[in-house]
Interface confidence: low
């Protein structure tokens, strides 16, 4: 028996259905077919689940969280134990390994391992104002999303015709900063910033209005 | 299942105001964002804006600021959409639409989206 | 703002394929749009999300007859083995500046 090589990772956004390859070669007629897909979770290793179970002529569901949103992806029993796993959510990130058995048929590789990872676009983002809007003043501008797997990265743009920041700002676009020393009444304005990661983008505006003292009546 | 179910056939007189539901059953109704989309009659898709649920936070198109109010009351899980000052020009069916996320983002389609409610501006 | 061009209308035989187009505006090449049927008298329903790059991902119970492509500013939806109730209108979407913005549509005919 011989368990195919997998193509290694497996990479969906939440919510879609993720399929985990698995096939092998026999020697034997599937009469005895057992195939076991258990996960190691990324959140907690220490812990490995079984997602599902074929075993003896029938399916049966492996840990709770599974139940309802796994199967194997053709009838069995086959050569292709393939499953999916429906909604898939970002606990369901791990080390997936179906481990198969069919005797009479022994020896050979009978596990193949395949990595899931789920995606979460960047949530709307919150965008907010740190310092005093004095003029002269120096101010940060920041930007977060609550979720977002691979980690979002940050872009500040100021919404006029050139879309640039002040040439006093300075960007990180990790920690999703900008901070814009000794603000002028060219800093005022609509300021767009953008959360993105590979599956998706958010935005959030925030409107910067300098404060020029008011002139001192005699 | 996830549902949205809206209100039924409107008959409106220009200048007048309409105000459709849409009630969500199958899901925790405060975790997704709302949006709404409507269809004249012939014509294409026009997104008019979202509601955030949990918020009551709304971001609206441009075309319909000052015209339409979208709320929502968390306790029957039911958004809103209303629209005044309604034109002719206003007779279409108005969807509800879910977001599966929860936020914007570009992988985060509508699904699923409500039945539809024809709306008719008519003196 | 993006615009996104659809033909305002195609044709094709039973059984037969078609490709249908949605171009993005320059500026907006890179972006992933979705595709959506509306069969008459229904609500739009999701086909699919298509990225820039070709890959994309069906909705459930949509079949395999449905799939996308990717070159530069156009993204294709190509349906193949075309069945009456393939008569519909398509549309492709795209989110932008937490807005969504939606293609003219494209009606196709089934002959």
């Known amino acids: 028996l011989e368990v195919s090589e997998s193509p290694g990772s497996v990479q969906v956004a939440r919510g879609q259905t993720a399929v985990l390859p698995c096939a092998f070669s026999t020697s034997a007629a599937l009469l005895n077919l057992n195939v076991i897909w258990m996960v190691i979770p990324l959140s907690n290793a220490n812990q490995p689940e079984q997602v599902i179970l074929y075993q003896g002529g029938q399916m049966f569901d492996g840990a709770l969280r599974f139940h309802g949103r796994v199967g194997f992806t053709g009838t069995m029993p086959a050569t292709n134990v393939s499953i999916f796993i429906n909604n898939t959510q970002l606990s369901d990130t791990g080390t997936y390994q179906c481990l198969v058995n069919n005797l009479p048929d022994r020896g050979g590789r009978n596990i193949g391992v395949t990595g899931l990872t789920v995606l979460v676009p960047p949530s709307a983002p919150q965008c907010q104002i740190q310092g005093s809007q004095d003029l002269g003043s120096d101010v940060i501008l920041l930007c977060s999303s609550e979720e977002g797997i691979p980690r979002p990265t940050y872009l500040w743009e100021k919404l006029d015709n050139t879309l640039k920041l002040p040439p006093t700002a300075t960007q990180d676009q990790v920690q999703g900063t900008v901070t814009i020393r000794n603000i002028s009444a060219l800093s005022s304005g609509l300021y767009q910033c953008v959360a993105s990661n590979a599956i998706g983008t958010s935005t959030c505006l925030l409107d910067l209005q300098v404060i020029s003292p008011q002139p001192r009546s005699v | 299942q996830v549902q949205l179910v809206q209100s039924g056939a409107e008959v409106k007189k220009p200048g007048a105001s309409v105000k459709v539901s849409c009630k969500a059953s199958?899901?925790?109704?405060?975790?997704?964002?709302m949006h709404w989309v409507r269809q004249a009659p012939g014509q294409g898709l026009e997104w008019m804006g979202w509601i955030n649920p949990n918020s009551g936070g709304t971001n609206y198109a441009q075309k319909f600021q000052g015209r339409v109010t979208m709320t929502r009351d968390t306790s029957i899980s039911t958004a809103y959409m209303e629209l005044s000052r309604l034109r002719s020009d206003d007779t279409a069916v108005y969807y509800c639409a879910r977001d599966p996320d929860g936020s914007g983002g570009s992988s985060r389609w509508f699904d699923p989206w409500g039945q539809g409610t024809l709306v008719t501006v008519s003196s | 703002q993006p615009v996104l061009t659809q033909s305002p209308s195609a044709s094709a035989s039973l059984g037969a394929s078609v490709k249908l187009t949605c171009t993005l505006s320059s500026g907006h090449t890179n972006y992933a749009i979705a595709w959506r049927q509306q069969q008459p008298g229904k609500a739009p329903r999701y086909l699919m999300l298509?990225?820039?790059?070709?890959?994309?991902t069906r909705g459930g119970g949509i079949p395999d007859r449905f799939s996308g492509s990717s070159s530069g500013a156009e993204r294709y939806l190509t349906i193949s083995s075309l069945q009456s109730e393939d008569e519909a209108d398509y549309y492709c979407?795209?989110?932008?500046?937490?807005?969504?913005?939606f293609g003219g549509g494209t009606k196709l005919a089934v002959l």
């Open positions: 298509l990225n820039s790059d070709g890959s994309h």
């Open positions: 199958g899901y925790t109704f405060t975790g997704y964002y």
């Open positions: 979407m795209i989110w932008h500046n937490n807005a969504w913005v």
